[in-house]
C-alpha cells in the first residue's frame, strides 16, 4: 500500500482470480441489463459468476469497486480492503441482493474456468509460478501479480527455474519485477528480462511480490519461478545482511508484515 506517481496504489487488487473477472459495456460503467450482462459473459465462453464464486475470488485478492450482475439476478461487488469511497468501510461481498427489476443497469461479473489467468495471493510453504500458458509462449498485454505472504518470522527463498522474456536494454517491453514487500511500491529488488537466469533472492521478511508485464508486440518462452519457505531457525536466514553469496541475493532486513 502506498503512493506511486501521485496515486494511492494497491496491487493486491487482482483483475481476475479463480476464473472470475469483471466486465463493463464498451460505453462504460453501469450500462448492462441482466440479459446483456449474461450475454457478455456467454460471448466470452463464460457465464455470470455465482455469489460463492465471487466470494472465493475475493478471498484470494479480487477487488473491484463496481457493482455488477451475478447469477440469478443478484448484484454486488467484492471488497478486499475497506476504503472511504468503496464498500461503506466493509470487506466482503457488498451485496445489493436479488434485483426485482432486471432492466436495471450494472456491470457484470463473469466466471470462466478455462480463462487463462495469472497471479494471486499465496500462503503455501512452497510453489512454482509460471508465466501464462507456460511452456508455450506467453501472450501480449499480460499483467500478473503474485503476492506471497508467509507466517511472521518466515522468509522467502526465490529461485528461477526457466527464464526467457523479450530482451531490451532497459527491460521496458516484457519484464518480471521483484519487490521485497506486499505491493509494487516498496522494497524494489530488481527488474529482469532476456534469457539469463537471475540469481536466487531471499526476502527480508515474510512477504514478497512478483509482477510480470508483457507489452503489445514480441513474446518469448516465459518463465518458471519457484519459492520455498526459509524458517527462522534455518542457516541461510542468519546471512540476511550479506549482499550476495554464491548464487543467492540476500536482502538487508527492513520490515515484516503480519
Amino acid at each position: 500500500w502506498g503512493f506511486k506517481n501521485g496515486i494511492f496504489h494497491n496491487s493486491i487488487w487482482l483483475e481476475q482470480a479463480a476464473g472470475v473477472y469483471h466486465r463493463e459495456a464498451r460505453a462504460g460503467r453501469y450500462k448492462l441489463t441482466y440479459a446483456e450482462a449474461k450475454a457478455v459473459c456467454e460471448f466470452e465462453g463464460g457465464r455470470l459468476a455465482t455469489y460463492k464464486q465471487l466470494e472465493a475470488a475475493r478471498k484470494i485478492g479480487f477487488h473491484v469497486c463496481a457493482a455488477g450482475w451475478m447469477a440469478k439476478g443478484r448484484v454486488g461487488y467484492p471488497i478486499v480492503k475497506p476504503g472511504p469511497n468503496c464498500g461503506f468501510g466493509k470487506t466482503g461481498i457488498i451485496d445489493y441482493g436479488i434485483r426485482l427489476n432486471r432492466s436495471e443497469r450494472w456491470d457484470a461479473y463473469c466466471y470462466n474456468p478455462h480463462a487463462k489467468e495469472c497471479g494471486g495471493v499465496f500462503t503455501d510453504p512452497k510453489r512454482i509460478f509460471k508465466s501464462p500458458g507456460f511452456p508455450n509462449e506467453y501472450d501480449d498485454n499480460q499483467v500478473c501479480y503474485w503476492h506471497i505472504r508467509l507466517k511472521y518470522g518466515q522468509r522467502i527463498h526465490l529461485s528461477f527455474l526457466d527464464f526467457d522474456l523479450e530482451h531490451d536494454p532497459g527491460c521496458l517491453a516484457d519484464y518480471v519485477e521483484i519487490y521485497d514487500s506486499y505491493d509494487d511500491v516498496h522494497g524494489f529488488v530488481g527488474r529482469y528480462c532476456g534469457d539469463e537466469l537471475p540469481e536466487d533472492i531471499i526476502s527480508t521478511g515474510n512477504v514478497m511480490t512478483l509482477k510480470f508485464l508483457s507489452d503489445a508486440s514480441v513474446t518469448a518462452g516465459g518463465f518458471q519461478i519457484k519459492y520455498v519457505t526459509v524458517d527462522p531457525a534455518s542457516k541461510s536466514s542468519q546471512a540476511k545482511n550479506t549482499s550476495t553469496t554464491g548464487n543467492k541475493k540476500f536482502l538487508p532486513g527492513r520490515f515484516s508484515h503480519l
Epitope: R26, K31, A39, V40, E42, D140, S217
Partner: antibody, heavy 120, light 106 residues
C-alpha cells in the same frame, strides 16, 4: 493502418473441405475478435461466427456449427476458417471482419473477401 | 434469433432528396449499427452505436432510434450514396444483419 488480407479464390468439389485464411496487420491481433461473414451471390450478409485470438475460444451460429471450424494463429496474426462437407449452397464470398472486444459488438474493418465456388 | 427487418427493400431517390430507411428488431437492442456495401466490394462500417458516423462518412448521414426501432437518414441524396445499406445488431447471439435496403438514384 489496419488491414485484413484474405486468401485467394477457391474452387472445390462437393464433399471436399477448404481452408480460408485472413492475415491481420496494423494492430495487436490478440486485442480484437475476428468474425466471419458469408454472402451468397446477390444476397445479404450472414454471420457465421467468431474467434477470440487471445484465448482461442470460438463460437459459430448454430446453422454453421457442423460446417465451419474457426482457428487463430497468434504467431502469424492469422485467423482461419475451415469449411467441410461442401455443397453448392456453400458457394459464396466469405469475409473476415474485426470487432472490438467490448459489448455490444460491431465490425470496424473487413477483409476484401474470398470467393468460394463449389462445382463438380 | 433477433430478426432485423429492413424497409423498404429497394428505394430510389433524386439528388438532393431526403432519404430515410428503417430497421426493426424482434428483440430490443441497446445499439444498432449500419454498413454500406457497393457492388463487388466489402461492406464498410457506416454508422455505429446507433448514431455515430464512422470515419470518412459524410455529415449528411445520420442514425437514430432505440429499443426495437432504428433508422438511417440521408439529409440530401447524392449519386455516391447509391449502395445497399445493412443494419446489424451485436447485442444478442447469434449476431444478425437485416436483409438490406438497396438505394438507387432516380
Amino acid at each position: 493502418q489496419v488491414q485484413l488480407q484474405q486468401s485467394g479464390a477457391e474452387l472445390a468439389k462437393p464433399g471436399a473441405s477448404v481452408r480460408l485464411s485472413c492475415q491481420a496487420s496494423g494492430y495487436t491481433f490478440t486485442t480484437y475478435w475476428m468474425h466471419w461473414v458469408k454472402q451468397r451471390p446477390r444476397q445479404g450478409l450472414e454471420w457465421i461466427g467468431y474467434i477470440i485470438p487471445s484465448s482461442g475460444y470460438s463460437k459459430c451460429h448454430q446453422k454453421f456449427k457442423d460446417k465451419a471450424t474457426l482457428t487463430a494463429d497468434k504467431s502469424s496474426n492469422t485467423a482461419s476458417m475451415q469449411l467441410s462437407s461442401l455443397t453448392y449452397e456453400d458457394s459464396a464470398v466469405y469475409y473476415c471482419a474485426r470487432s472490438t472486444s467490448g459489448y455490444p459488438y460491431y465490425f470496424d474493418y473487413w477483409g476484401q473477401g474470398t470467393t468460394l465456388t463449389v462445382s463438380s | 434469433e433477433n430478426v432485423l427487418t429492413q424497409s423498404p427493400a429497394i428505394m430510389s431517390a433524386s439528388p438532393g432528396e431526403k432519404v430515410t430507411m428503417t430497421c426493426s428488431a424482434t428483440s430490443s437492442v441497446s445499439y444498432m449499427h449500419w454498413y454500406q456495401q457497393k457492388s463487388s466490394t466489402s461492406p464498410k462500417l457506416w454508422i455505429y452505436d446507433t448514431s455515430k458516423l464512422a470515419s470518412g462518412v459524410p455529415g449528411r448521414f445520420s442514425g437514430s432510434g432505440s429499443g426495437n426501432s432504428y433508422s438511417l437518414t440521408i439529409s440530401s441524396m447524392e449519386a455516391e450514396d447509391v449502395a445497399t445499406y445493412y443494419c446489424f445488431q451485436g447485442s444478442w447471439y447469434p449476431l444478425t444483419f437485416g436483409a438490406g435496403t438497396k438505394l438507387e438514384l432516380k
